[in-house]
Every structure is written in C-alpha cells, then in structure tokens.
C-alpha cells in the first residue's frame, strides 16, 4: 500500500485584512490512524494553529467534517485575518500513540495579507 502523503496544493495564498483565509490540506490515505495538526512556521518554535484532537482555536474552523472517520480533507478557515497572521502554515499528520508522533508534513502554504480595501 502506498504511503500516506499530505497535500497542500496552494504554495501561497493572499487574503485581504479582515477576510477569512482558507488553507487547503488533504491526505491520500486513512492509514496510519492519528490526528492532523496545523502549525505556523517550522522547527522547534512553530506555533500550534489547530489541533484536531483538542485545544482552544476560536478563529479556526474546519472546512469539512474532519471528525468523520473516512474524512481525508483537513482544510481550515482562519477568520478575521490581520497582518500578524502572515507566515507559512503547515498541515502535519501524526501517528496515534502515547504521545502521538509526527508522521508527515505538507510542503506548507505561505499566507500573505493585503491591506483592507478602502
């Protein structure tokens, strides 16, 4: 069986301040079992943007019903975008365990923020 891939189709996304940003992410397999997390940045200091399992993410909603067992679309929408939200966002698949371990990352989507249209 082919190994799971994490696909972030958009290399970059540009959004006007105040609008919502949709960041696309799909996986190609249901195996291994485990959650998806979204991060801004790479490396040790990356910021957690969304965790499928738990957490407080008031500006983030999932585009599809990510809790459904057969779901393979883990795209998210971030509301009320400001210039402080600019950065590269990564969709990361984890393998279930204690603790969950990182399995594979998408290539990243760079979010840039345009000035609010007057």
């Amino acid at each position: 069986e082919e190994e799971l891939q994490v696909i972030q189709p958009d290399k970059s996304v540009s959004v006007a301040a105040g609008e919502s940003a949709i960041l696309h992410c799909t996986v190609t397999s249901l195996i291994p079992v485990g959650p998806i997390q979204w991060f801004r940045g790479a490396g040790p200091a990356r910021e957690l943007i969304y965790n499928q399992k738990e957490g407080h993410f008031p500006r983030v909603t999932t585009v599809s019903e990510s809790t459904k067992r057969e779901n393979m679309d883990f795209s998210i929408s971030i509301s009320n975008i400001t210039p402080a939200d600019a950065g590269t966002y990564y969709c990361v698949k984890f393998r279930k365990g204690s603790p969950d371990t990182e399995f594979k990352s998408g290539a990243g989507t760079e979010l840039s923020v345009r000035a609010k249209p007057s």
Epitope: R40, A42, G43, P44, A45, R46, E47, E102
Partner: antibody, heavy 117, light 108 residues
Framework: DVQLVESGGGLVRPGESLRLSCAAS????????VTWVRQAPGEGLEWVSL???????YYADSVKGRFTISRDNSKSTLYLQMNGLRAEDTAVYYC???????????WGLGTLVTVSS | EIVLTQSPGTLSVSPGERATFSCRAS??????LAWYQQKPGQAPRLLIY???TRATGIPARFSGSRSGTEFTLTISSLQSEDFAVYYC??????????FGGGTKVEIK
Amino acid sequence: DVQLVESGGGLVRPGESLRLSCAASGFTFTNYAVTWVRQAPGEGLEWVSLISVTGTTYYADSVKGRFTISRDNSKSTLYLQMNGLRAEDTAVYYCAKVTWKNVFDYWGLGTLVTVSS
Amino acid sequence: EIVLTQSPGTLSVSPGERATFSCRASQTVGSKLAWYQQKPGQAPRLLIYDANTRATGIPARFSGSRSGTEFTLTISSLQSEDFAVYYCQQHTDWPPYTFGGGTKVEIK
C-alpha cells in the same frame, strides 16, 4: 496581558538539585514553545533550553544531561529540573514565550539561582 | 554554533543624539537577527526581529538594518528611557539560539 512568573530559585550547594517553575497566563500556553534563558551576575544572556508545543526538548551543551525542561499544559506551567548544579550555573533564570519566528517576545522577571559551598 | 560579536562594548551618547551599534555573525543567518533591550534589574524586551521588523509597541525611533552578516541597530534620537544594554540574538530555525555580548548605552 501576557504574564510569566518564575519561582523556585534559591541558594544550593554544588552537586545539589533545584526545580524552577514558570506560571504562564494571558495567552494560550499549549499553542507556543517556551524557553529558559539565564544571565550570570554582571554577564550577558545565555539560552538554556526550549520545549516545543509537541513536547520536543532542546538544550544548550553546557546543561545537557543535567537539566530537564518540561511543561504541564493543564497548569500552563513550564519547569526546569536542574541536577548536578555547579558554581557556573549561578544566574538569574528567565522563562520566555517563543514566537514562531524563534524570538522571545514575553519574559518573566526571573528567579535567582545561587550555587555556592 | 553561531557566534555574535557586538561592538562597541559601551557607547556614550547625549540625550537627543543618534546611537548606532552593530552585531556581526560568524556565519550567515540571513535576516534572522533580533535585538533586545535590558534595563538594570529588569527582564529583556524584544525590540526588533527579522533584522528590521519592530516588535509590537516599539517606537519608530528604533530601526534595524543588515548588510551581509553585519547588523546595525539605530536609535534616531535617544530618550532618557533608552539608556540600557542592548543584545542581539540570531533566530534561525534551530537551537542553540545565541546572543551577542551586549552593548551598554550610557549617558555622555
């Protein structure tokens, strides 16, 4: 307002242990990496250790194998377990919130650790 | 490990004057350099990151620039509250995160 409050510093003898705590508030603790930075009396800043949002830990060579960083997300608290303390570990220890840019945007006021016989 | 060398060690400036000091990296860090201000008995405060981006709430009199591996922090017109020690820090993606030795800006 973001607040970081360190505690647990004090005077210990060489070879002894100490555990520092850093209570965080004003931000979603689980979403950010956090770090310890120290400053010996009259000296500059030295990065000590960092723990990522997923719990991966990183250490300066000078403390590797002696210090252990950990976090309790349910308590929004960062810890630094310091074993085998040496005179050269004497410093003010600061905890700081780390941005995704790898910079330290909020700092606590620090707690003084003195290692002396 | 990336070594950061700050110069001068001490800078004597009169209030209202311009202050400029530098930080040189031993190897390339791109634009990943930050500046912090520390006053006696206080914690450091983030001023600048990515070589020239001011942190939230930092006045426009503070500016940063880069030329290769040499970075400069400029305070256009020194206020009394600006007399402090200034540290640079490289913030490339992976530890160890290193700091320069500091530049003390004192009243002339």
